[in-house]
């Protein structure tokens, strides 16, 4: 999450010993309060591994460290999904999995983690400095995204930091460690607050920036607990982007937007953009490959072209993705 909260600046205390001590005891509670507020913030981890057997084959593993239920997971490369990245796979916990080349196999590992194997050959195969991103959506609470890539000096078979091999144990140790520190911090904060209970409250100085806190992104929840999680995105090396699988629409807008009804409630079903036959029941999909329809089994890859939904001010390159016309 990248929701930001503004903390009002405190009026500096009077100089002198009391002022210096007062300043320290005033700053510390704010720091501890921020830690306490963000203690329950869900996080996403990403592990990128190059297979020793196939040098250009990658395994991406992603996990969600949070208590909320996941409604959708999107894996992309070349940057965050929706910001120039190309979608590789979309996983729904109940309805199935859809994936696009060069993704070979996407699957759920646990209820909160997924893995994706990428094909090792072809023009669209990844290379060592490709950035992979995972976005976990929990509708309507919010969505959390993190990115990772192989370190430049990675040997085949080695996984990218920061996630060690026994992920579950490492995560657990981290959670316990951080929880311990935060618990101590929260207790200390309460102690400080009780000590300062009878002192006059410091005057709050309005923040120099806009009085209104910046609104979270469209998908971000408006919870204060999401305040301090800033996911650093790795720099995208454009020379190592996947091959242009999709072509942007010449007019910049989505090719299907104009075909949607402007007033009528029900329109007759015309020729579909990617599957004119009715979509089968849960657990079964219509796959479109080379213009041929094929009925697939339970949770197969859904290699279907899509359409760009919205225009992009940055031009055609940003429109690359599973929604371009193949």
């Amino acid at each position: 999450m990248r929701t930001e909260a503004q903390v009002p600046a405190l009026q500096p205390p009077e100089p002198g010993l009391e002022g210096a001590m007062g300043h320290r005891t005033l700053v510390l509670p704010w720091v501890l309060l921020t830690l306490c507020v963000t203690a329950g913030t869900p996080e996403v981890w990403v592990q990128v591994r190059m297979e020793a057997t196939e040098l250009s084959s990658f395994t991406i593993r992603c996990g969600f460290l949070g208590s909320g239920s996941i409604s959708l997971v999107t894996v992309s490369w070349g940057g965050p999904n929706g910001a120039g990245g190309t979608t590789l796979a979309v996983l729904h916990p109940e309805r199935g999995i859809r994936q696009w080349a060069p993704a070979r196999q996407a699957r759920w590992e646990t209820q909160s983690s997924i893995s994706l194997i990428l094909e090792g050959s072809g023009a669209s195969s990844p290379c060592a400095n490709t950035t992979f991103c995972c976005k976990f959506a929990s509708f309507p609470e919010g969505s959390w995204e993190a990115c990772g890539s192989l370190p430049p000096s990675s040997d085949p078979g080695l996984s990218a930091p920061p996630t060690p091999a026994p992920i579950l144990r490492a995560d657990l140790a981290g959670i316990l460690g951080v929880s311990g520190v935060l618990l101590f911090g929260c207790v200390y904060l309460l102690h400080l607050l009780r000590r300062h209970k009878h002192r006059p409250a410091p005057r709050l100085q309005p923040s120099r920036t806009s009085p209104q806190a910046p609104r979270a992104r469209a998908w971000a929840p408006s919870q204060a607990s999401q305040a301090a999680l800033h996911v650093p995105y790795a720099t995208i090396n454009t020379s190592c982007r996947p091959a242009t699988l999709d072509t942007a629409h010449p007019h910049g807008g989505p090719s299907w937007w104009a075909s949607l009804p402007t007033h009528a409630a029900h329109r007759p079903q015309g020729p579909a953009a990617w599957a004119s036959t009715p979509i089968p029941a849960r657990g079964s999909f219509v796959s479109v490959e080379n213009g041929l329809y094929a009925q697939a089994g339970e949770r197969p890859p859904h290699t279907g072209p899509g359409l760009t939904l919205f225009p992009d001010p940055r031009g055609p390159r940003a429109m690359e993705g599973p929604l371009g016309v193949r």
Partner: nanobody
Amino acid sequence: EVQLVESGGGLVQPGGSLRLSCAASGFTFSGDCMGWFRQAPGKGLDEGVATIDNAGRIKYADSVKGRFTISHGNAKYILYLQMNSLRAEDTAVYYCAAGWTFGGQCSPADWGQGTQVTVSS
């Protein structure tokens, strides 16, 4: 990131009408469906009040068929939901969302902050 901003919610009497709007802006969204979802107070999220996929197929929840109409603005990227003959059970936070189709259902990947619709006399 794609930004979806809903508007048009409010308080309306039973039998009344409201028109919700969803303005889409920002970067490319890589999905294949859009629609309106709602969450009633103390209840779970509805599968999808009204959704459109990239083939132009429209799907309505049984509870709103014949009363709600989903449509779009051609020039600007705006999605609408015309709600007529509103009932008390339509009271909810309505979300505009864009996502991916699974088994004929639109699963949200990006959504707005929601707009409150209250149907009460």
